[in-house]
């Protein structure tokens, strides 16, 4: 009896694991084995596929074959008993195109109100993703074990910290990788759970802000208790992307070590151009807080996010405000090549009641003013990038009197 060729061959590639699955064409015939050959692009001869010769099951692994993952490959299979079936040719494919990203490895650390997530590619030193190691981004789904209400967090890197959690609570999460450059989304890791600790005696510092004064950066934060000492550390933001080494060498800012106030001043030249993460920790001599939330700090934006300059055209019932580029020393305008939004605050000179307008435009109307009344205006700029979320300081207040009635035209 002639043996039939096997059918429905499927190639599954996850990271560096190459698996073949197929259907037996004739279940009634026993003791059949299967063998594969492969052929590279531009070659005429077929080569035996090691790991997939004389297989008795309907699955084999050819991960040991050192292939160029960007090169097209063709496979063929046949059944063997006393005689052999005809070859069944599988559609040619490129391993890299066919490959899926496997589940990443996840390592969790708990604090009282935060969880640190360290993510590594599932296959260490993967051949498949050798050129893409630094391009991986991750997304995760996290939920309280008790409620199951899921929150999704997209576009994170190999280290991510989730804040504002509840103490003594078990959180569960799963993570998947993506290679956005190749339109590949990976499969989720197994679910990992961790319990946050009992609440710490000392809370971490909050509301960290950086501003520029003269040639210095001024770092300010809020703290609940008095008589504390603080230290500030920085890290290059790009190091959060490092997929291999989960050692983060946070650096001390010398002028911000053991400071007794909720601010510290340090020279701008401490940082070269770049994006950094900053964090602050409090200590009372016996106990230490956990680190504050890490804030992103871009020297380019920080240095040049100066308060806006504006002119006011006064009418009887409104002001027209024209916002221009801020001036550097030497009266040259600063070119700001990132989108900004403007916060304009105005108030009647004789009152403390402030009103606020948020505008993307550089010409703004402040409506509903009273004639012949002095109003004061100040403005500041904000970046529109959620992640950087930087603000300039407010400009000096400018006060103007509205015109008499009927001059609004």
């Amino acid at each position: 009896k002639n043996l039939k060729s096997p059918q429905k061959v499927e190639v599954d590639i996850i990271d560096d694991n190459f698996i073949l699955r197929w259907n037996r064409s004739d279940e009634s015939v026993g003791n059949v084995t299967f063998s594969f050959d492969y052929q590279k692009t531009g070659m005429d001869n077929w080569i035996k596929l090691s790991g997939c010769q004389n297989i008795t099951s309907t699955k084999c692994n050819f991960s040991s074959l050192k292939l160029n993952v960007y090169e097209e490959i063709k496979l063929r299979i046949r059944a063997e008993k006393e005689n052999t079936s005809s070859w069944y040719e599988v559609d040619s494919f490129t391993p890299f195109r066919k490959a899926q990203i496997g589940p990443p490895e996840v390592h969790l650390e708990a604090e009282d109100k935060a969880i640190v997530i360290h993510i590594s590619p599932g296959t260490k030193d993967s051949v498949m993703w050798a050129l893409d190691g630094l391009s991986f981004t991750y997304s995760l789904v996290i939920w309280k074990n008790s409620s199951g209400v899921e929150e999704r967090i997209e576009n994170i890197y190999s280290r991510h910290k989730i804040y504002k959690l509840s103490p003594e609570t078990t959180y569960c999460l799963k993570v998947k990788a993506a290679l956005l450059t190749s339109w590949k989304i990976g499969v989720y890791s197994p679910v990992h759970c961790i319990k946050t600790t009992v609440e710490n005696e000392l809370p971490p510092p909050e509301n960290i802000e950086v501003s520029v004064q003269n040639q210095n950066y001024v770092l300010k934060w809020d703290y609940t208790y008095a008589n504390m000492t603080f230290q500030v550390q920085w890290l290059h933001a790009f190091l959060k992307r490092n997929p291999g080494n989960h050692l983060y060498k946070w650096k001390q800012i010398p002028d911000c070590e053991n400071v007794k106030t909720t601010q510290c001043v340090f020279p701008q030249n401490v940082f070269q151009k770049g994006i950094y993460l900053l964090r602050v920790q409090a200590s009372d001599g016996n106990n230490t807080s956990f680190w504050s939330e890490e804030i992103k700090f871009d020297t380019e934006i920080q240095a040049f996010l100066l308060p806006p300059v504006f002119n006011i055209r006064s009418l009887s019932d409104s002001f027209h405000i024209y916002i221009g580029a801020p001036k550097q020393s030497g009266n040259t305008p600063v070119i700001q090549d990132y989108p900004l939004i403007y916060e304009i605050i105005f108030w009647e000179n004789t009152s403390n009641a402030e009103r606020k307008i948020i505008e993307k435009k550089t010409d703004v109307t402040v409506p509903n003013l009273k004639p012949l009344t002095v109003y004061c205006v100040k403005a500041r700029a904000h970046t529109m990038d959620e992640k950087l979320n930087k603000s300039s300081v407010f400009s000096d207040a400018v006060c103007e009197k509205t015109k008499p009635g009927n001059t609004s035209k």
Partner: antibody
Amino acid sequence: EVQLQQSGAEVVKPGASVKLSCTASGFNIKDYYMHWVKQRTEQGLECIGRIDPEDGETKYVPKFQGKATITAETSSNTAYLQLSSLTAEDTAVYYCSRGGSYYVMDYWGQGTSVTVSS
Amino acid sequence: DVVMTQSRKFMSTSVGDRVSVTCKASQNVGTSVAWYQQKLGQSPKALIYSASYRYSGVPDRFTGSGSGTDFTLTISNVQSEDLAEYFCQQDNSYPHTFGGGTKLEIK
């Protein structure tokens, strides 16, 4: 294979100084922290300090500030511990270790015995 | 500095038994605790990090648990080669302090 090879045992006089070395192979010390740890006979482990060989930044346990100086030479992939004004209290085995992922001291040298005796 | 206290200086156990070595931190250190094993005349060796993660090559009879201030290293099915001293260490805040050690004796 990752290895940390420490210099040989030292017998020194009180008041003198000694410099211990720790040469790494199988990895680049610039990518890690290098720690020094003290262990007195029948006693526990005590951190002395650490260095980031990439930029030379050091951190000392306050108790060892002024007593210990940690340096590193990236060209020879070596970390050093210098101990000054030695007293009998400094008689101990000194270990270098690598600070790796998650701050674990994942590899240790074989230890260097320092005996302070007149 | 954070003080790490290992209250039992010595523990006695038999081959095949299960034994738990405990460690208490003077303040909340999250899960930033590692465990090391030191056999007589040898250098310490990393066993557990981040409170519960086993270091590569460490047999799965070694298990770490705990968070906040209370941590435990459990050795199930104790083997004769587990005769050693065990140290905990916190790496939540500098200096990274060690516990005083617990010597495990095999009966």
